[in-house]
Interface confidence: medium
């Protein structure tokens, strides 16, 4: 994933639409002008904003890495949304990058659940049928997440 | 290249007063909010305040704004940090910092090297 | 003021395993949309560096091993595999409102 440029000492292009700031905020895919008196658009496929805001610049696209697809692409009001390609998925716990998923299930066990790009294949003994993760055998893991925590633009 | 480059500490008495400049070069100084964040030795950071391009906007940290004067002089591409009343606990490295664009205030994207200033009789 | 507490004040992480270091704001540090939470490594002798900004956007430069996530209060920088130039002082500061202020930082150790 590329990173955010922080100088690029960018002007608004003539041709780049301007309104004006509802109390000081401009609206989803804009951002303000320097002297606070309008709202710029954002550049579509260059750089987005998803939410009311009062930044100088927008926010510049994500590029999907290596090993990523690019599901949607960047608007002005939304950024690029990238996902692990065939045969590889993205643990939530390290996000940042493809894991491959595993070819088949340990002997005495079968497989439940294909290879998503959110989750490896899941396995499960034939007898018991509880779960192999391939870390703890025979443990069922559980996965949780925080409520207040926003989805990765790249999950 | 961004850069800053602070002068003026030193070695204060209690109840002294000093002068801190950062000279700033690489961007267009006039367009840009710049701040003072200061860092006792072996502690964390600590945001002094900060001036907006045309000095008519100056906001402090409310425990500092009456012993501490931020100014600027763009002519000069210079920040100032008038500091008074100082006390052994102002003694501190004294960063230059210019935020970065978004928000009001943002994040700090630039530093320079500090200066540091040491009260002590 | 909006106090941000960081946990732990400091921790060893082997080399390639994954340091994970939290974020606590008094209160919410989102607004419209938008978590104004960053984080900052500082070694010794050097001034902070910006890793990332508003929560999870990571500066220009900055490898893809760290990673932010959080909004409202709670925030997190993930580093991960964690390599020898890690080693350093993590800051978390907010800039929902003024005075922007910073959490305790974390040293983080390399084993």
């Known amino acids: 994933i590329t990173r955010q440029s922080l100088d690029p000492q960018r002007r608004a292009a003539p041709q780049q639409k301007r309104s004006s700031p509802t109390e000081g905020l401009c609206p989803p895919g804009h951002h303000i002008s320097e002297d606070s008196r309008e709202c710029i658009s954002c550049k579509y496929g260059q750089d987005y904003s998803t939410h009311w805001n009062d930044f100088l610049f927008c926010l510049r696209c994500t590029k999907c890495d290596s090993g990523e697809v690019e599901v949607n692409s960047c608007t002005t009001t939304r950024n690029t949304v990238c996902q692990c390609e065939e045969g590889t998925f993205r643990e939530e716990d390290s996000p940042e990058i493809c894991r491959k998923c595993r070819t088949g299930c340990p002997r005495g066990m079968v497989k439940v659940k294909d290879c998503t790009p959110w989750s490896d294949i899941e396995c499960v003994h034939k007898e018991s049928g509880t779960k192999h993760t391939g870390e703890v055998p025979a443990v069922e893991k559980t996965v949780t997440t925080s409520p207040g925590t926003p989805a990765s633009p790249c999950s | 290249e961004v850069k800053f480059l602070e002068s003026g500490g030193g070695l204060v008495q209690p109840g002294g007063s000093l002068k801190l400049s950062c000279v700033a070069s690489?961007?267009?100084?006039?367009?840009?909010?710049m701040s003072w964040v200061r860092q006792a030795p072996g502690k964390g950071l600590e945001w002094i305040g900060e001036?907006?391009?045309?000095?008519?906007?100056?906001n402090y940290t409310p425990s500092l704004k009456d012993k501490f004067i931020i100014s600027r002089d763009n002519a000069k591409n210079t920040l100032y940090l008038q500091m008074t009343k100082v006390r052994s606990e102002d003694t501190a490295l004294y960063y230059c910092?210019?935020?970065?664009?978004?928000?009001?205030?943002?994040?700090?994207?630039?530093w320079g090297q500090g200066t540091l200033v040491t009260v002590s009789a | 003021d909006i106090v941000l507490t960081q946990s732990p004040a400091s921790l060893a992480v082997s080399l390639g395993q994954r340091a994970t270091i939290s974020c606590r704001a008094s209160?919410?540090?989102?607004?419209?949309?938008?978590?104004?939470m960053h984080w900052y490594q500082q070694k010794p002798g050097q001034p902070p560096k910006v890793l990332i900004f508003?929560?999870?956007n990571l500066d220009s430069g900055v490898p893809a091993r760290f990673s932010g996530s959080g909004s409202g209060t709670d925030f997190t920088l993930n580093i991960h595999p964690v390599e020898d130039g890690d080693a350093a002082t993590y800051y978390c500061?907010?800039?929902?409102?003024?005075?922007?202020?910073f959490g305790g930082g974390t040293k983080l150790e390399i084993k």
């Open positions: 910092t210019r935020r970065a664009y978004y928000g009001n205030p943002a994040w700090f994207a630039y």
């Open positions: 690489g961007f267009d100084f006039s367009r840009y909010w």
């Open positions: 001036i907006n391009p045309d000095s008519n906007t100056i």
């Open positions: 209160k919410s540090v989102s607004s419209s949309g938008y978590s104004y």
């Open positions: 508003l929560s999870s």
């Open positions: 500061q907010h800039s929902r409102d003024l005075p922007p202020t």
